[in-house]
């Protein structure tokens, strides 16, 4: 069975965490995407979805939420810039397939931000050029209200071991090691 | 160590198809990506696509969709990258390559094959 | 598709002289740029990415900078084994490209 894996990301305030999340081109390329925060025992919150049709590597913009799906090549590309502290949590990569629940897409990320930054030129730490120059044309797409209550009520358990999730072959399995991300700005 | 061992030359003949095979060793198969990238006899290098081999989920540059089908077996941590349609300006060597973490959008591609030489000819 | 163009296309020099590569982009990609080195016969070899972290092993002769369109690969001083044809990628936006090569010969 596939492998729900959960990466985790540990970044610096002001730096931007940029991931992509990939799904079957054939089935959901042109289908709505979106990017939710699962907060412990609480329903995902979806903060950003692409347009509905989703369109072509069209950037859309809320807040500090960049997201551009690659639908000729079966990847959503998230971009968090600027991060806080406050945006440490666990985050998924959903498809809305209404009146179906959401589909969930590999993997969850795990940020964890931290204060402050080793700020010596061309250190993979660096924070100083973290200005991302968005197309103007970007918009903000308006998300579905509703979350599924059998997606994910609570966060993930602690432990190692392989946790079926309703209806699929996916398992969740939990990866400790850090990702300490090349120069994401 | 590391290492993407890829299957030897091939000579096949335009319309035919060819199959090259990845065989990854030395890390978390399922936790990197793996894309292929050719480069014509005293060419540059044209990256084809990649694929997640965790997810089993793929995609392509344009002017070979419909035309390349990316594989995988977990079992012997081994991708396959199919050409159909073949024609002459196929020829090419054919690389696999590991790029970031699949979930990362870091594309830099830290470990390649050996390259397999494929040869369209009639 | 962002396009990348690379120069010069070859350039000669002599053991222990700086070697400069440009690459520019068609369109801004922050500093989402890698630097390959591809000797006769043989697969290339990442040398820089993100425009200038040198990745793991690679002497510290070789060096990266630049961001938005306009990128730069030194060769601090150039030794034999330098030989080679150097490739700049971008992965900014996809499809993902690579510029044309320089290929670097010693004088």
């Known amino acids: 069975a596939t492998k729900l894996t959960e990466e985790k990301y540990e970044l610096k305030e002001g730096q931007t965490l940029d991931v992509k999340c990939d799904y079957t081109l054939e089935k959901f390329a042109s289908s709505q995407k979106a990017w939710q925060i699962i907060r412990d025992g609480e329903m995902p919150k979806t903060l950003a979805c692409t347009e509905r049709p989703s369109k072509n590597s069209h950037p859309v913009q809320v807040g500090r939420i960049i997201l551009e799906d690659y639908h000729d090549h079966g990847l959503l590309r998230v971009r968090m810039v600027n991060l806080q502290v406050e945006d440490s949590g666990l985050y998924q990569c959903v498809i809305y397939q209404p009146p179906k629940e959401p589909h969930m897409l590999f993997d969850r990320i795990r940020l964890v931000v931290t204060k402050g930054f080793s700020g010596t030129p061309g250190s993979n730490e660096n924070s100083t050029q973290n200005v991302y120059k968005i197309p103007p044309t970007t918009t903000k797409a308006l998300c579905p209200l509703y979350t599924s209550p059998r997606t994910v009520t609570q966060a993930p358990p602690k432990s190692t071991a392989d946790v079926s999730t309703p209806d699929s072959e996916i398992n969740l399995t939990n990866v400790t090691d850090i990702i300490r991300v090349p120069v994401f700005n | 160590q590391v290492q993407l061992v890829q299957s030897g030359a091939e000579v096949t003949k335009p319309g035919a198809s060819v199959k090259v095979s990845c065989k990854a060793s030395?890390?978390?198969?399922?936790?990197?990506?793996i894309n292929w990238v050719r480069q014509a006899t005293g060419q540059g290098l044209e990256w084809m696509g990649w694929?997640?081999?965790?997810?089993?989920?793929?995609g392509s540059v344009q002017k070979f969709r419909g035309r390349v089908t990316m594989t995988r077996d977990t079992s012997i941590t081994t991708v396959y990258m199919e050409l159909s349609s073949l024609r002459s300006d196929d020829t090419a060597v054919y690389y696999c390559?590991?790029?970031?973490?699949?979930?990362?959008?870091?594309?830099?591609?830290?470990?390649w094959g050996q390259g397999t030489m494929v040869t369209v000819s009639s | 598709d962002i396009q990348m163009t690379q120069s010069p296309s070859s350039l000669s020099a002599s053991v222990g002289d700086r070697v400069t590569i440009t690459c520019q982009a068609s369109q801004d990609i922050n500093n989402h740029l890698n630097w390959y080195q591809q000797k006769p016969g043989k697969a290339p070899k990442l040398l820089i990415y993100g425009a200038y972290t040198l990745e793991t092993g690679v002497p510290s002769r070789f060096s990266g900078s630049g961001s938005g369109t306009d990128f730069t690969f030194t060769i601090s001083s150039l030794q034999p084994e330098d030989i080679a044809t150097y490739y700049c990628?971008?992965?900014?936006?996809?499809?993902?490209?690579f510029g044309g090569g320089t290929k670097v010969e010693i004088k």
């Open positions: 694929m997640n081999p965790n997810s089993g989920n793929s």
């Open positions: 390559a590991r790029g970031g973490i699949s979930s990362s959008w870091h594309w830099a591609f830290d470990i």
């Open positions: 030395g890390y978390t198969f399922t936790r990197y990506d």
């Open positions: 990628q971008q992965y900014d936006k996809l499809p993902l490209t």
